[in-house]
Amino acid sequence: PEPPTACREKQYLINSQCCSLCQPGQKLVSDCTEFTETECLPCGESEFLDTWNRETHCHQHKYCDPNLGLRVQQKGTSETDTICTCEEGWHCTSEACESCVLHRSCSPGFGVKQIATGVSDTICEPCPVGFFSNVSSAFEKCHPWTSCETKDLVVQQAGTNKTDVVCGPQDRLRA
């Protein structure tokens, strides 16, 4: 028979032969042959593989570094990685939770809608037209543009979401 060019699900092609992939939690020791099955071995104590695979090395479980404020939320198994979370009152910097912050700041152009608590991080909102924020802050709201009219001045430079308007003197030459 013709050697296969594609294999079934949970198989891989090697030496013109379809071999079974190793199941999650196991790594490849040796490929199958015409006479033998694929040989797989369970991952070690602090290792895992989360897919059907032909990996010769298992992945190390993630380390939740207490020096970064991390602790184990869910212990890893041979098939799953460890899930880290932050100490109480701290917040993950990303979905992968690789480090912790007390709270995040809102960038220029955004204001604080809600200050962080022990449970929820800072909630930011874009500054609407007529308001601005020129700082990175975890407490400051968007500030309204200066009203030049109330100071008997005129707008010399329009405001943006990151900058205030610039006021200047009235043009006295106008009729």
Epitope: N67, L68, G69, C86, E87, W90, T93, S99, C100, V101, L102, H103, R104, S105, V135, S136, S137, A138, F139, E140
Partner: nanobody, 116 residues
């Protein structure tokens, strides 16, 4: 290396006052918003007060409004928290914090105990 060193804590009677300091080094102090955060024994973190880099904007938690005053001296790279009319529930370790507020900037804090 960023360093934040809190001081000024101690034992005080209810109704008394204390002034906490936070000496900052390793960064351009005036360019950063700063916070005071406290942790009471067996409790979570509470964000107490914050001040903008220039000192022009401040924030106070409802629990301390009217009693605590945050300030900064950018020429001395120092943050302050003046605490008046202290109550038993103000007992906590007080920490100062700077953006980006990461855990590895977290100092030892200074312990404030309000008791008669």
């Amino acid at each position: 290396e960023v360093q934040l060193l809190e001081s000024g804590g101690g034992l005080v009677q209810p109704g008394g006052s204390l002034r906490l300091s936070c000496a900052a080094s390793g960064f351009t102090f005036a360019g950063y918003e700063m916070w005071w955060v406290r942790q009471a024994p067996g409790k979570g973190l509470e964000r107490v007060s914050a001040i903008s880099g220039s000192g022009g904007s401040t924030y106070y938690a409802d629990s301390v409004k009217g009693r605590f005053t945050i300030s900064r001296d950018n020429s001395k790279n120092t943050l302050y928290l003046q605490m008046n009319s202290l109550r038993a529930e103000d007992t906590a370790v007080y920490h100062c914090a700077k953006e980006p507020y990461s855990y590895d900037y977290w100092g030892q804090g200074t312990l404030v105990t309000v008791s008669s």
